[in-house]
């Protein structure tokens, strides 16, 4: 970068090289060139010569002033016009940065995705800082009082094998950059309560020829958790509002869920599960589309993520239903 150049003088920034966005700043340039009493000192920002707000302080030094500086990064350098020199002579350069101190991290969440072997912790970092910001995740055992710290620039995966201090922990996050430091509230977790079952996947759909045609959605999960609660949401693709069916599920078998749908309409389905009574849900599964036939012949739709599916034994799900509107993903 610009900081690696050989200098014939000195460039510095007040209040600092990294400063809060929107501040007034001064950049000083002091020449120390042999056999040169500079006629003029020039400042350049990102290679473009600055024309205004330059003050000559003394024979060797000048100041460039910026009001309300809003650029996240800029490369500054200054030059001197020396007598008998045809070209400007480079004095020195510096990279400057502006940004914000970190917000207090909130919404700290730690989950263990089944089979992952990791505890994944995430948080809301708040507003963009524009400058290098690091996070230290503190994990303290409530049984042994032992504390571990993990440095990261976003989220963190912590191997469950390294969590040797029992099942109960406090987790908190410290955010720090050149402009400040903040700490989140402490989150208390129990490792058995934060497991999210292996992803539920919709594999196929078929509409059965009957007096009232019915659509069967086939879905499954590789989870070994015994008590699992799931939700399947569905709607016509032209609708804003989701219908939601709830299921208490045993994944010993591929699940079959029945729906009575309008003919000749494209529907979209998603499923998600959680360990019954626990706090965290899986993210919704991939969007699965199925168009019901115009009349009654049997129609099959396969999930785009599977070519074939070994359905094995099947069991009909018992469900209850309600409506929900997810207006972020749809118009609303």
């Amino acid at each position: 970068g610009i900081t690696n150049i050989n200098c014939s003088g000195h460039i510095w920034v007040e209040p600092a090289t990294i400063f809060k966005m929107g501040m007034n700043i001064s950049i000083y340039c002091q020449a120390a060139i042999k056999n040169c009493q500079p006629r003029k000192l020039h400042f350049y920002k990102n290679g473009i010569k600055e024309r205004f707000q330059i003050t000559r302080i003394n024979k060797t030094t000048a100041r460039l002033w910026y009001k309300n500086f809003l650029e996240p990064h800029a490369s500054m350098y200054c030059t001197a016009e020396c007598p008998k020199h045809f070209q400007e002579t480079l004095i020195c350069g510096k990279d400057i940065s502006s940004g914000y101190p970190p917000d207090i991290p909130d919404e700290v969440t730690c989950v263990i995705y089944e089979y992952s072997g990791n505890m994944t912790c995430t948080w809301n970092a708040g507003k963009l800082t524009y400058i290098d910001t690091k996070y230290v995740v503190h994990v303290k055992s409530l049984e042994t009082e032992e504390e571990q710290q993990y440095l990261t620039s976003s989220y963190i995966n912590i191997s469950t094998d390294s969590l040797q201090g029992g099942k109960k922990y406090l987790v908190w996050v410290q955010a720090a950059n050149a402009l400040g430091m903040e700490e989140s509230k402490q989150l208390q977790i129990h490792l058995d309560d934060i497991v999210i079952p292996s992803a539920a996947v919709i594999s196929r759909a078929e509409t059965i020829n009957a007096t009232v045609p019915k659509t069967i959605i086939y879905w499954d999960s590789q989870t070994t958790i015994e008590k699992v609660s799931c939700e399947m949401r569905y709607k016509a693709t032209t609708n804003q509002t989701w219908n939601v069916k709830e299921f208490d599920t045993n994944f010993t078998y591929v699940q079959q869920s029945e729906f009575y749908l309008e003919p000749n309409i494209k529907y979209v389905f998603q499923v998600r599960c959680q360990e019954t009574g626990k706090r965290y849900w899986q993210p919704w599964s991939s969007l699965f589309f199925h168009k019901t036939p115009e009349t009654v012949p049997q129609v099959t739709s396969k999930a785009f993520q599977h070519d074939t599916w070994n359905s094995g034994l099947t069991v009909a799900s018992i469900s209850t239903g309600h409506l929900t509107s997810d207006n972020r993903g749809d118009i609303g």
Epitope: A236, T237, T238, V268, S286, L287, F289, R328, G329, I331
Partner: antibody, heavy 117, light 107 residues
Framework: QVQLQQPGAELVKPGASVKVSCKAS????????INWMNQRPGQGLEWIGN????????NYNEKFKSKVTLTVDISSSTAYMQLSSLTSDDSAVYYC??????????WGQGTTLTVSS | DIQMTQSPASLSVSVGETVTITCRAS??????ITWYQLKQGKSPQLLVY???NLADDVPSRFSGSGSGTQYSLKINSLLSEDFGTYYC?????????FGGGTKLEMK
């Protein structure tokens, strides 16, 4: 088969209004959204808004809200987009398209609107 | 509004080559992305919806992938009829903005 028919071109004077039509056929008109897009010369596509003929629900891109009014005539399976207070900036190709909340699956050929005195 | 940054803006390729066009969303759009082909004098054509789903009658040489903020459209073994302009569009909260387009030209 599904078809959306639009007039090929419209020539209007600055300050006037124009109503661009989009006649649908080959499907149940009231069961899909009709979307409107434009493409200015040498530019990309912009989504203007949509209307659901089954309930006359509309959604507008904020940028076009004061410029555009979307309507339908169910008896003729036709959607309309009215553009008001026209300027040369409104000169563009305007497309209608059938769609849902995941895709626009059938498009009209586009109407070239020229605003010129 | 969500911005869709499409790249490259143009691509000069030969018949038989494989091309990949990418779209980056300014925030997570949860696979709510669609790809279209525009050709001079023809109606725009839907190719892929919801990131990975091939539209009816679209040849299998077209495929979509991606998640979060990064998505791509791949065209295997390009045919002469595939030249034109390609657009991505998100469907995650209005306005449903388009990418800037990728013009596929014959080398």
């Amino acid at each position: 088969q599904v078809q959306l028919q639009q007039p090929g071109a419209e020539l209007v004077k600055p300050g006037a209004s124009v109503k661009v039509s989009c006649k649908a056929s080959g499907y149940t008109f009231t069961k899909y959204w009709i979307n409107w897009m434009n493409q200015r010369p040498g530019q990309g596509l912009e989504w203007i808004g949509n209307i659901y003929p089954g309930s006359i629900s509309t959604n507008y891109n904020e940028k076009f809200k004061s410029k555009v009014t979307l309507t339908v005539d169910i008896s003729s399976s036709t959607a309309y987009m009215q553009l008001s207070s026209l300027t040369s900036d409104d000169s563009a190709v305007y497309y209608c398209a059938r769609g849902d909340f995941y895709a626009l699956d059938y498009w009209g050929q586009g109407t070239t609107l020229t605003v010129s005195s | 509004d969500i911005q869709m940054t499409q790249s490259p803006a143009s691509l000069s390729v030969s018949v038989g080559e494989t091309v990949t066009i990418t779209c980056r969303a300014s925030e997570n759009i949860y696979s709510h992305i669609t790809w279209y082909q525009l050709k001079q004098g023809k109606s725009p054509q839907l190719l892929v919806y919801a990131s990975t789903n091939l539209a009816d009658d679209v040849p299998s040489r077209f495929s979509g992938s991606g998640s979060g903020t990064q998505y791509s459209l791949k065209i295997n073994s390009l045919l002469s009829e595939d030249f034109g302009t390609y657009y991505c569009q998100h469907f995650w909260g209005t306005p449903w903005t388009f990418g800037g387009g990728t013009k596929l030209e014959m080398k």
